[in-house]
């Protein structure tokens, strides 16, 4: 706590400017009026204050607004935002996308801090859903943002927002997240023609079911191996050799290099060796000729 001391003669701050950088901690406390600070917050960001001086300014705002800062102050916090705790931010009501952008700009180049995570959470909850403009903004600052959300949180993303998603935004998503995002993407891109559709849907295919992969195999899409390797194993297993060949097109040769890795390994185990041999890739491990394959899961479902 800063001691309450009288402001020295002639040092009372009439405005917030860089003359304050030569004030000791106690002088700032005594000579800067909190209401003046609140109305001139936009100036603080341009002034080379020390850490301790910013501490004093924050303390003044906390005293003036014990229930949380108004948005007019929040929007102009600038680097002072870095001194806020998640507890401080939970008191805020941030509704303007411009305010969100201004504060994310301050944190640019840093990892997503607990403060930023709290800010985003408050903002999204206030809006009720993750709309396109918000998602656009968040993924621009934090490409991994989408994949940091739980499947439950992702369910509030409207399909229209999917247009804002770039392939790199999905790099760290796990299958459960893609399971939620894929149907939204399918809906969002449904009116596009074949090749354009595939370009857009490609990065979401880790959530695609078998029937959609079968449909894609009829469209000459030439899926690359990297995308194929991210597909759900349970969605790949029922595909026939012919369907995989059509799905991958010229990239089918890449299966040989991946034959020991999932989902390729598991898929090979489900195919007849005769069928695999038609690819001419030397893939081994298929079902030998003359063996009967019983689908026990199907049998259980019937009984």
């Amino acid at each position: 706590e800063v001691e309450k001391t009288a402001c020295p003669s002639g040092k009372k701050a009439r405005e917030i400017d860089e003359s304050l950088i030569f004030y000791k901690k106690w002088e700032l406390e005594a000579c800067v009026d909190a209401a003046l600070l609140a109305t001139q917050m936009d100036r603080v960001n341009a002034i080379p204050f020390t850490y301790e001086q910013l501490d004093v300014l924050k303390h003044k705002l906390d005293e003036l607004y014990p229930q949380g800062y108004p948005e007019s102050v929040i929007q102009h916090l600038g680097y002072l935002f870095l001194k806020m705790s998640p507890e401080d931010i939970r008191k805020w009501n941030v509704t303007s996308l411009e305010t969100l952008k201004a504060l994310l700009e301050v944190n640019k180049g840093h990892e997503m801090s607990p403060q930023v995570a709290t800010l985003i959470d408050r903002f999204v909850k206030g809006r009720g859903q993750l709309d396109k403009d918000t998602l656009d903004t968040l993924t621009a600052f934090y490409p991994g943002y989408l994949c940091s959300l739980s499947p439950e949180e992702l369910s509030s993303v409207p399909p229209s927002s999917i247009w804002a998603v770039r392939p790199q935004d999905l790099d760290t998503c796990d299958p459960r997240q893609l399971d939620v995002l894929y149907p939204k993407a399918r809906l969002a891109f449904q009116n596009m023609n074949g090749s354009e559709y595939f370009v857009k849907i490609q990065s979401f295919l880790g959530g695609a079911p078998t029937e959609d992969l079968k449909a894609l195999s009829q469209q000459n899409v030439s899926m690359d191996l990297a995308t194929f390797m991210k597909l759900r194993t349970d969605a790949v297993l029922p595909l026939t050799v012919a369907e995989v060949q059509k799905l991958l097109g010229p990239h089918v040769e890449g299966l040989k290099a991946e034959e020991r890795h999932r989902p390729v390994r598991d898929w090979i185990l489900r195919q007849r060796q005769d069928d695999l041999d038609t690819l001419g890739l030397g893939l081994q491990g298929g079902i030998p000729n003359g063996y009967l394959v019983l689908d026990l899961s199907m049998q259980e479902a019937l009984s």
């Epitope: 003359s19 950088i21 901690k25 020390t50």
Partner: antibody, heavy 121, light 107 residues
Framework: EVQLVESGGGLVQPGGSLRLSCAAS????????MSWVRQAPGKGLEWVSG????????GYADSVKGRFTISRDNSKNTLYLQMNSLRAEDTAVYYC??????????????WGQGTLVTVSS | DIQMTQSPSSLSASVGDRVTITCRAS??????LNWYQQKPGKAPKLLIY???RLQSGVPSRFSGSGSGTDFTLTISSLQPEDFATYYC?????????FGQGTKVEIK
Amino acid sequence: EVQLVESGGGLVQPGGSLRLSCAASGFTFSSYAMSWVRQAPGKGLEWVSGISGSGGSTGYADSVKGRFTISRDNSKNTLYLQMNSLRAEDTAVYYCAKHGQVGGISVFDIWGQGTLVTVSS
Amino acid sequence: DIQMTQSPSSLSASVGDRVTITCRASQSISNWLNWYQQKPGKAPKLLIYATSRLQSGVPSRFSGSGSGTDFTLTISSLQPEDFATYYCQQSYSFPWTFGQGTKVEIK
């Protein structure tokens, strides 16, 4: 090109006075706080004094308070340090430096090449 | 005032060497630490701010780390133009204070 050029250093006797100048160019001088930083022979850098862009606010290190006066003439883009009652321990290279801020952190972002002040009888 | 102490005060190294300079603050200064480089007869130059962020134009062989009271400046592969004196400076508290400098000389 952003530049700071100090002048006015020299040999002075203990108890004497000296006035240092720093001519600035390449930036809006009146918009920035400025400081004097010194370096005694074989020692580290020491902040001596600073002044706000308007000249309305100043700060001093305890070691020079009451003896040194910082001022500026924004019409001439010049910073000054009036040094009175000089002591042997004031012997140093004196640098003028511009205050700046990067990523929210206060820094001295532009420096002059320095002027040597020697206090000796 | 916060005291800043650098070590070593000087060191000899060869081109290509990895060089580490340390700076200790007399109290915690979070990450509010800057590094400057000064070549003989020249003005000091801002190298790193906020402990680890490189000032524009500074080569990536320079890096900074630390927090609280202990900080490090590392030059991963010393180049001929890196022979100079390096200073740390705290921006945590007014008045601003510097370390006494570390001179990096040619072995």
